[in-house]
């Protein structure tokens, strides 16, 4: 539980930039939470570097991270989930740099899954649905979702729709006829907890029907 490195200590090590970032995932494995940290500089020599978290823990002073290639990882039930923890990069007993972080403000939800799109011919629309593991969780239950879709040929022209439910209706007339679309979704905490966007769900691809010449409407696929 040593503090910051003293001046003159570990002189070579202190020439490096040990900036790091972390994210937490709550109830990621049953009732277990996880905390993942990584250096912002991918070229940092991590050979002798360790991460340690102290404070805001249940009945322990500190926990050590496991090293998994270039990331550092903890899975535990021992987060109090209130107040700030002290997360330090260490060489042996010496701390090179530390950050005070409230784990409830760096939550990264799990990626949504089971994304699908169903065309409703009578309604002339597409119903987008997806699932999230957070519906079953005790803590991070309220999420904002970002649904992004694009015509496959338009590499960077994504249209984004924010929603709090797991169902979205896209009107057929807003989409190009006879076109292939890619759609994906991600999530971010939206109540009490704060943090980062999840990873994107796997993309789903769907084709819009052609326009029916006589009526000006799209043909079903």
């Amino acid at each position: 539980e040593s503090g910051y490195a003293q001046n003159g200590d570990l002189e070579d090590a202190e020439l490096d930039d040990y900036s790091f970032s972390c994210y937490s995932q709550l109830e990621v494995n049953g009732s277990q939470h996880s905390l993942t940290c990584a250096f912002e500089d991918p070229d940092v020599n991590i050979t002798n570097l360790e991460f340690e978290i102290c404070g805001a823990l249940v009945e322990v002073k500190c926990l050590n991270f496991r090293k998994l290639q270039e990331i550092y990882f903890i899975e535990t039930k021992k987060f109090l989930l209130i107040g700030k923890s002290n997360i330090c990069v260490k060489v042996g007993e010496k701390s090179l740099t530390c950050k005070k972080i409230d784990l409830t403000t760096i939550v990264k939800p799990e990626a949504p899954f089971d994304l699908s799109v169903v065309y409703r011919e009578g309604a002339n629309d597409f119903v987008v649905t997806f699932n999230t593991s957070h519906l079953q969780k005790k803590y991070v239950k309220v999420l904002m979702h970002d649904v992004a879709y694009r015509q496959e040929k338009d590499e960077n022209k994504w249209t984004h729709v924010n929603l709090s439910s797991t169902k979205l209706t896209l009107l057929q007339r807003k989409l190009q006829p006879a076109a292939m679309y890619e759609i994906k979704v991600r999530s971010i905490p939206d109540h009490y907890f704060k943090g980062f966007w999840s990873e994107w769900s796997p993309s789903y691809y769907f084709r819009t029907p052609e326009i029916n010449n006589s009526s000006g409407e799209m043909d079903p696929i």
């Epitope: 539980e1 805001a56 823990l57 249940v58 500190c62 107040g83 700030k84 005070k100 409230d102």
Partner: antibody, heavy 119, light 105 residues
Framework: QVQLVQSGAEVKKPGASVKVSCKAS????????MNWVRQAPGQGLEWMGL????????SYNQKFKGRVTLTRDTSISTAYMELSRLRSDDTAVYYC????????????WGQGTTVTVSS | EIVLTQSPATLSLSPGERATLSCSAS?????MHWYQQKPGQAPRPWIY???KLASGVPARFSGSGSGTDYTLTISSLEPEDFAVYYC????????FGGGTKVEIK
């Protein structure tokens, strides 16, 4: 203003249990830990445990684990400390204290509840 | 578990004198806090995170230290400063020192 108001003094027999309440006002109850600290007559301070009122997660001093139970009722912003199997050396003033989560010090204290254990 | 030893147990000084209270930890502590307690009253936060003065604490108080040795200093004692002062580690199990009583000589 921020305030913690504790229940009144108690006299208990050895082997009995005591439950002390701590009513919080003037702040968001679920935003800070509630800690319990005791002080035997003429002695120093001893941390017993804490509760996170948001989720009910508790952390106990190993010395008291199994004898102390911390609970809360968020609807009335009140925390409770129950100590069981009382002994004469549990005679003390029991304080609730709000935990500042940025620095982990106890920034607001209740007035204290005197618990006397005597046969 | 870390043990915090405060010295001296009692400090007998006159108003206007300088007071130096020590808190020694059995192993390294990142942050230390200090509380003031007067007879019949609850403790009051006095100095937190080594050197930050709690609300309403006069500037004649200061805190310093690192590792295992921490100090609370009162530059010039005022009558209201005579009390018991406790140090406390910031982390589980939030151990307190035994206290230093600052009394009027």
């Amino acid at each position: 203003q921020v305030q913690l108001v504790q229940s009144g003094a108690e006299v208990k027999k050895p082997g009995a249990s005591v439950k002390v309440s701590c009513k919080a006002s003037g702040y968001t109850f679920t935003g800070y830990t509630m800690n319990w600290v005791r002080q035997a007559p003429g002695q120093g301070l001893e941390w017993m445990g804490l509760i996170n009122p948001y989720n009910g997660v508790t952390s106990y001093n190993q010395k008291f684990k199994g004898r102390v139970t911390l609970t809360r009722d968020t609807s009335i912003s009140t925390a409770y400390m129950e100590l069981s199997r009382l002994r004469s050396d549990d005679t003390a003033v029991y304080y609730c204290a709000r935990g500042d989560g940025n620095y982990w010090y106890f920034d607001v204290w209740g007035q204290g509840t005197t618990v006397t254990v005597s046969s | 578990e870390i043990v915090l030893t405060q010295s001296p147990a009692t400090l007998s000084l006159s108003p206007g004198e300088r007071a130096t209270l020590s808190c020694s930890a059995s192993s390294s502590v990142t942050y230390m806090h200090w509380y003031q307690q007067k007879p019949g009253q609850a403790p009051r936060p006095w100095i937190y995170e080594i050197s930050k003065l709690a609300s309403g604490v006069p500037a004649r108080f200061s805190g310093s230290g690192s590792g295992t040795d921490y100090t609370l200093t009162i530059s010039s004692l005022e009558p209201e400063d005579f009390a018991v002062y406790y140090c406390q580690e910031w982390n589980y199990p939030y151990t307190f020192g035994g206290g230093t009583k600052v009394e009027i000589k």
